[in-house]
Interface confidence: medium
Amino acid sequence: KFSKQSWGLENEALIVRCPRQGKPSYTVDWYYSQTNKSIPTQERNRVFASGQLLKFLPAAVADSGIYTCIVRSPTFNRTGYANVTIYKKQSDCNVPDYLMYSTVSGSEKNSKIYCPTIDLYNWTAPLEWFKNCQALQGSRYRAHKSFLVIDNVMTEDAGDYTCKFIHNENGANYSVTATRSFTVKDEQGFSLFPVIGAPAQNEIKEVEIGKNANLTCSACFGKGTQFLAAVLWQLNGTKITDFGEPRIQQEEGQNQSFSNGLACLDMVLRIADVKEEDLLLQYDCLALNLHGLRRHTVRLSRKNPIDHHSIYC
């Protein structure tokens, strides 16, 4: 769960973030997993730790391996693992699959291609962009901040896009490249009767008394921008705001997410400090649009707690 795959090319900069997130003030210690040897924090080292970040300036093929990060909060040590692979530079133009970041889709209305992992680096604009190894030229292409905008997207714009930028560390410059595929989708929108993806109908959700619990109501309504679509939770047939239990709140801000081209909405129900009486309630996930309303019911059941919290036995 708290392991992350990272990769880079030899002689380029690679910066990896600890998969265990902590508050900015938390101390983070990095180790070579195999030897348990501490990674230095002094910036004069080629590989050094800097808080939540592990920096390879530049990376070497021999750096490949698993790195352990321990986020030290006042009481709890939370461990994460970064699985790092450094590859030799390819002589030809072809970018192998194992160097590709996640594919992004674009359409006539939305054609942003974000440069992967760039937020980890100290870079300055402009970015250089390449498609299938050719530098992008022409007024249709605009490098803006950390992304590329393509005007009047056509199906021929699909392909592999590489961003190249310079990372600066204490006055020294290091090159970084990252590649991802871009696909073009046809934006023909339509609306459907709501389909609730989660929770399942009559689902039983196990919760621990005294702990916090989250229930997610997730539904899809068709493709493209929807005129009217909403998801919400009800308790015993009553709106959350009218139910009057401050421990139980819906998370605001339903963001439309176009995954697989579908327009979907999420609403999270947060129950703080679960009590016995919460197990008696009926939780309804409602999804509605112009076609109508669909309802899935959830009930809570008690989960027997296992004492796995204490790190001191």
Epitope: K23, S25, R72, S73, P74, T75, F76, H309, Y312
Partner: antibody
């Protein structure tokens, strides 16, 4: 200004249970882990355990496992400690204390005096 | 558990002069990250403890610079350069290297 306001003094019978509260103000509740400390003339300051309001994680001193249960209510920014099966050995002043990474036990409540007597 | 050892009383000091309070831990408090997890607290009469020093040598916010701390991984000293009447109380050292966190028994600062 971070403040921790603890509940008032308690006088309880042996064998009973009691819940002490600690209400935080002046900061974001989830930014601090809540530590609980016992103070007696004989044993001095003893760490009971800690609760992370952000994750719900708890850690206990083995000595107080089964005796103390730590919880919190984020909506009211209040941490709780329940002490069960009380004996005269549990008579003490109990402190809650907020900790950040560098500042362990940075802020302290005023303490709650617990007396267990028949 | 890590045992923190303190003497119960300091040598009585005159106001305006310096005072030293010592503390010893049963194991090194030096973490592999280079931080020494040793803390000092002062409990004034009738009050809750308050943080003075964190990570062996860092002054907590609002603490006068008359206070300083030094030490190795196991032996530590808290120094007060010019003792004032308000410094009276019990000084506790504590370790936060590993669970359970442990405190010293406290050293009472006495004025001549």
């Amino acid at each position: 200004q971070v403040q921790l306001q603890q509940s008032g003094a308690e006088l309880v019978r042996p064998g009973a249970s009691v819940t002490l509260s600690c209400k935080a103000s002046g900061h974001i509740f989830t930014d601090y882990e809540m530590q609980w400390v016992k103070q007696t003339p004989v044993h001095g300051l003893e760490w009971i355990g800690a609760f992370d309001p952000e994750t719900g994680d708890t850690a206990y001193n083995q000595k107080f496992k089964g005796k103390a249960t730590l919880t919190a209510d984020k909506s009211s920014s209040t941490a709780y400690m329940e002490l069960s099966s009380l004996t005269s050995e549990d008579s003490a002043v109990y402190y809650c204390s907020g900790s950040t990474t560098d500042y362990y036990f940075a802020y302290w409540g005023q303490g709650t005096s617990l007396t267990v007597s028949s | 558990d890590v045992v923190m050892t303190q003497t119960a009383f300091s040598n009585p000091v005159t106001l305006g002069t310096s005072a030293s309070i010592s503390c010893r831990s049963s194991k090194s408090l030096l973490h592999s990250n280079g931080i020494i997890y040793l803390y000092w607290y002062l409990q004034k009469p009738g009050q809750s403890p308050q943080l003075l020093i964190y990570q062996m040598s860092n002054l907590a916010s609002g603490v006068p610079d008359r206070f300083s701390s030094s030490g190795s991984g196991t032996d530590f000293t808290l120094r007060i350069s010019r003792v004032e009447a308000e410094d009276v109380g019990v000084y506790y050292c504590a370790q936060n290297l590993e669970l359970p966190f442990t405190f010293g028994s406290g050293t009472k600062l006495e004025i001549k």
